[in-house]
Interface confidence: medium
């Protein structure tokens, strides 16, 4: 009796092999797909990290894309100087030169007449004169007492450049822009043979109900904390220090049942601003029990411990902490490289290969 296969059987074997191959390829593809969720309180740097991914892994912003940010740069600059001027009234700070009071009213009128994406020479002149004023500078130095964009000084110090009629924002200008994220922004890129899907989520508490239940099957969570927020008050809730708000959110994420098998990566961000602030504002503003010195290293290490101690499953869950400056492309590149290695290692572990 011969053991030759009929044409029908051969086709069935081929089909079976093809199914196996497809399953294997699907499995490999799934293993190469990385779903990253960016979480953190408002203005902690999540969207800046996303912008960095575009710069590092997608050849950055084209000239055309940069041009589209011009209106945001102008809006951020104008909002910043207006926030400082308004705060002067509340903090009872006088202008160094009384003639600046005229400029302040002129600012409001000109800003209200400004066309989006344009800055007239007179508006630029008014802002420049105000920014140079000693009273305005004194108020700027007390910015922890009111809400001010982190990028305020960056743009205001560079007004001569950004007010040029032919101004095109640079990659760094784009990185520094502040637009409140509403809803969920998805970004895709490939790195180290992995296909990343990164989800940027609005940090303000009003946004949280939109995403908290949606993200099972996430490979890793990058949780951003603004280190420099230790002496600020939360915008939506004047009662709670921003750092404590951030800790509360981290606690709820880190110990959430949906994220039991999810790697938690902690970005202690804005380390550059923190390093400057800690020289002037003691950490006891945020942590009255802190007895260490107000050096960058010791204060930063203390904040790191405060967050890592919130992890209730220390035996089974590791938190991977990095100190970051989201506006520094080299720093983000280095950190993200390390993060990817952790993800690869954990993926191999899940497949029993490590």
């Amino acid at each position: 009796m011969g053991c030759t296969l009929s044409a029908e059987d051969k086709a069935a074997v081929e089909r079976s092999k093809m199914i196996d191959r497809n399953l294997r390829e699907d499995g490999e593809k799934a293993a190469r797909e990385v779903k990253l969720l960016l979480l953190g309180a408002g203005e902690s740097g999540k969207s800046t990290i996303v912008k960095q991914m575009k710069i590092i892994h997608e050849a950055g912003y084209s000239e055309e894309e940069c041009k589209q940010y011009k209106a945001v740069v102008y809006s951020n600059t104008i909002q910043s100087i207006i926030a400082i001027i308004r705060a002067m009234g509340r903090l009872k700070i006088d202008f160094g030169d009384s003639a600046r009071a005229d400029d302040a009213r002129q600012l409001f009128v000109l800003a209200g007449a400004a066309e989006e994406g344009f800055m007239t020479a007179e508006l630029a002149g008014v802002i420049k004169r105000l920014w140079k004023d000693s009273g305005v500078q004194a108020c700027f130095n007390r910015s922890r007492e009111y809400q001010l964009n982190d990028s305020a000084a960056y743009y205001l110090n560079d007004l001569d450049r950004i007010a040029q009629p032919n101004y095109i924002p640079t990659q760094q200008d784009v990185l520094r822009t502040r637009v409140k994220t509403t809803g969920i922004v998805e970004t895709h890129f490939t790195f180290k043979d992995l296909h990343f899907k990164m989800f940027d989520v609005g940090g303000q508490r009003s946004e949280r109900k939109k995403w908290i239940h949606c993200f099972e099957g996430v490979t890793a969570i990058i949780f951003c904390v603004a280190l420099s927020d230790y002496d600020l008050v939360l915008a939506e809730d004047e009662e709670m220090n921003r750092m404590h708000e951030s800790m509360k959110l981290f606690d709820s994420i880190c110990n959430n049942k949906w994220f039991t098998d999810t790697s938690i990566i902690l970005f202690l961000n804005k380390k550059d601003l923190f390093e400057e602030k800690i020289k002037k504002s003691p950490l006891t503003i945020c942590y009255p029990e802190y007895a260490g010195s107000n050096t960058y290293e010791e204060a930063a290490a203390y904040i790191q411990c405060q967050f890592e101690d919130l992890n209730k499953r220390k035996d089974t869950k590791e938190i991977y902490t990095h100190f970051t400056c989201a506006t520094d492309t080299k720093n983000v590149q280095f950190v993200f490289d390390a993060v990817t290695d952790v993800i690869i290692k954990n993926n191999l572990k899940d497949c029993g290969l490590f």
Partner: nanobody, 120 residues
Framework: EVQLVESGGDLVQPGGSLRLSCAAS????????MNWVRQAPGKGLEWVAS????????DYAHPVKGRFTVSRDNTKNTLYLQMNSLKPDDAAVYYC?????????????WGQGTQVTVSS
Amino acid sequence: EVQLVESGGDLVQPGGSLRLSCAASGFTFSTYRMNWVRQAPGKGLEWVASISSRGITTDYAHPVKGRFTVSRDNTKNTLYLQMNSLKPDDAAVYYCATDPSTWYRGTAHWGQGTQVTVSS
């Protein structure tokens, strides 16, 4: 539709007086801080004076302080600028404008302006 219509501009001799008016419609005038702004030939816009929504506080630019008086009548939806001791430097097109509600993106409303000429 928001409308601001200025009137009262004229040719006047140095040292003379004028009273400008601005009739507002299409918005709740009584809730807006209002401004007078001027533009001299070949020059940029210059803020002149402002008045709070209920007329309690007023502000003046340095060059006009003590000579100009801003006032309003919310029952008539009208803004005024009394100009005394006029100088050649005061010659300009005078506009009334709302204070911008969100401070940016073309949120202030402007009138078409009224011409003030100061000459002997």
